[in-house]
Each structure stands twice: as structure tokens, then as C-alpha cells.
């Protein structure tokens, strides 16, 4: 089976690696622009230089290309708690991340929010906090896990999933209620 190629891939595949086919003359292969630059003008003929210009401030290209414009630098989303790890350069996009003792929660492939790692109060750390995953906690006796926090079994209602973990405590609470004591 031959893989389906898009028009740009078809055009590029005619030329050797590092070159692309001239859009107006398919007998000419032009050298691609280096990262950090973009295509200003196609090469006028075989063996002649492609006119590449450096990306302007606030834009970049991270690989060799024949793009007519550089890509806009990403901005770290302060409202999502993101901080800038490294600023944008002509050949590398901005790198955004989270502060120490925080992890990333991805709302989508490209959008993440920073959250504080759980400290496992009233429990122990089962798995340490990682870049993209919160700490995994194991709760002490008399506590159950709710939204990755160890909550006292006194907050466990019969309708919740905590009933199995907190069964003795629930029975005690029920017994107290039945006896009429305060």
C-alpha cells in the first residue's frame, strides 16, 4: 500500500532532503531555510541561493522550512498558573511550565493548568508528584480518599463510595444516632 501524501509532501518528495520544489517551476529544487529563518523569496534557478530572512522578534521557526512567515511565539497562560521556563528565541518557541511542587493538568492537548501537589495529610505518599500527575496518596485508618485528599470518615455518608473503607466508623455513627445520645 502506498501512503497517501498531501500536495506539499508530494512536492517535497521529488527533491532531495533539505530541498523543496520551486512552486512555479517543478524542475527546480531550492534549498530550505535554516531554523530561525523563513522563506522571503524562492531560489531563482538551480544551484542558486534561496532568499531566507531571520525571524523577527516575537516569532520563530524551530526546524528547516520553506514557510512564508515565522510562527508567533506562544505566551504562557498566567491565568492558568503557568510560568515561563525559557523565553522565545528565533529558533525555539517559549517553554511554559509550573512552579516547584506543582503539576500540570491538561484541559486539552495544548492547554494546561498548574495545580499544587497533594501533601497527603492524614495519609502517606504512594506515588510522588510528577510533571503531569498529582501525588497518589494512601490514607490512614479512619480516613478515605476524596479528590486526592484524605478526609475523615466522619464525613462519609452512606450514599458515597467511602462506605466500604469507613464501614466500622459508619456503624459507630449509626449506633450513636439510634441510642439518642448527643
Amino acid at each position: 500500500l502506498v501512503p497517501h501524501l498531501g500536495d506539499r509532501e508530494k512536492r517535497d518528495s521529488v527533491c532531495p532532503q533539505g530541498k523543496y520544489i520551486h512552486p512555479q517551476n517543478n524542475s527546480i529544487c531550492c534549498t530550505k531555510c535554516h531554523k530561525g529563518t523563513y522563506l522571503y523569496n524562492d531560489c531563482p534557478g538551480p544551484g542558486q541561493d534561496t532568499d531566507c530572512r531571520e525571524c523577527e522578534s516575537g516569532s520563530f521557526t524551530a526546524s528547516e522550512n520553506h514557510l512564508r512567515h515565522c510562527l508567533s511565539c506562544s505566551k504562557c497562560r498566567k491565568e492558568m498558573g503557568q510560568v515561563e521556563i525559557s523565553s522565545c528565541t528565533v529558533d525555539r518557541d517559549t517553554v511554559c511550565g509550573c512552579r516547584k511542587n506543582q503539576y500540570r493538568h491538561y484541559w486539552s492537548e495544548n492547554l494546561f493548568q498548574c495545580f499544587n501537589c497533594s501533601l497527603c495529610l492524614n495519609g502517606t505518599v504512594h506515588l510522588s508528584c510528577q510533571e503531569k500527575q498529582n501525588t497518589v496518596c494512601t490514607c490512614h485508618a479512619g480516613f478515605f480518599l476524596r479528590e486526592n485528599e484524605c478526609v475523615s470518615c466522619s464525613n462519609c455518608k452512606k450514599s458515597l463510595e467511602c462506605t466500604k473503607l469507613c464501614l466500622p466508623q459508619i456503624e459507630n455513627v449509626k449506633g450513636t444516632e439510634d441510642s439518642g445520645t448527643t
Epitope: 484541559w107 492547554l111 479528590e147
Partner: nanobody, 122 residues
Framework: EVQLLESGGGLVQPGGSLRLSCAAS????????MGWVRQAPGKGLEWVSL????????YYADSVKGRFTISRNNSKNTLYLQMNSLRAEDTAVYYC???????????????WGQGTVVTVSS
Amino acid sequence: EVQLLESGGGLVQPGGSLRLSCAASGFTFARYNMGWVRQAPGKGLEWVSLIDPSGGHTYYADSVKGRFTISRNNSKNTLYLQMNSLRAEDTAVYYCGKPVFSDWPAVEFDYWGQGTVVTVSS
């Protein structure tokens, strides 16, 4: 057919509270991020809050942080927005929906409701 039906809006005095509900049907509610946006008179749409499928992660716009609480009940296919300490600037049409994040912070939804009006006035 996907349906999202908001309710709970109304007229409230500054400092008062309201609880908005959003009943969802026609899709697997429990699998998706959900959110609330609002549109104040003569203004554009703005994000208010987001919640992930489990309810364990939430996002709030700075303007509502500490006053609004988003929650969900997946067994009832319902999204909620508890609004406390309401201010005149919270006056808007509030919409719930299933968000898309292709161009954050632009507001985009796959599905959204018809909206519920919240008016904060003395």
C-alpha cells in the same frame, strides 16, 4: 440530540447568592470537561469556570475566584455554579457548555445551552 438546559437565574441584590444548574442530555456527560461562560450587556463572551470529568480539577476566572464554585453530579448529568457575594458586574447571561480549547482564551463550545439571565441590582 444534544441538549443543555440552564436554570436558576434571576434578580438578586448585591451580596446575594444564586445557584445555576445545567441539565445535560444526548451525550456521555461524565466523560467530558464542562464549563460556564457569561456575556454581560454589550460585552463579549468570557470564561467563568471549568471542571474536569471527575470534578477534581477546576478553573475560575480571576473576577469570580473565591466567590463562585463549580461542581457536577455525573449520576444526574447536571452541572452547577454556586454564585455567592454577587456584584453588579456579575450581571450577564450565563451559558453552560462542553468546551473546546483550540484557541484559549477564545470562548469555544461543541455544545451549549440557551442561557439563563442573572441580574444583580438593588
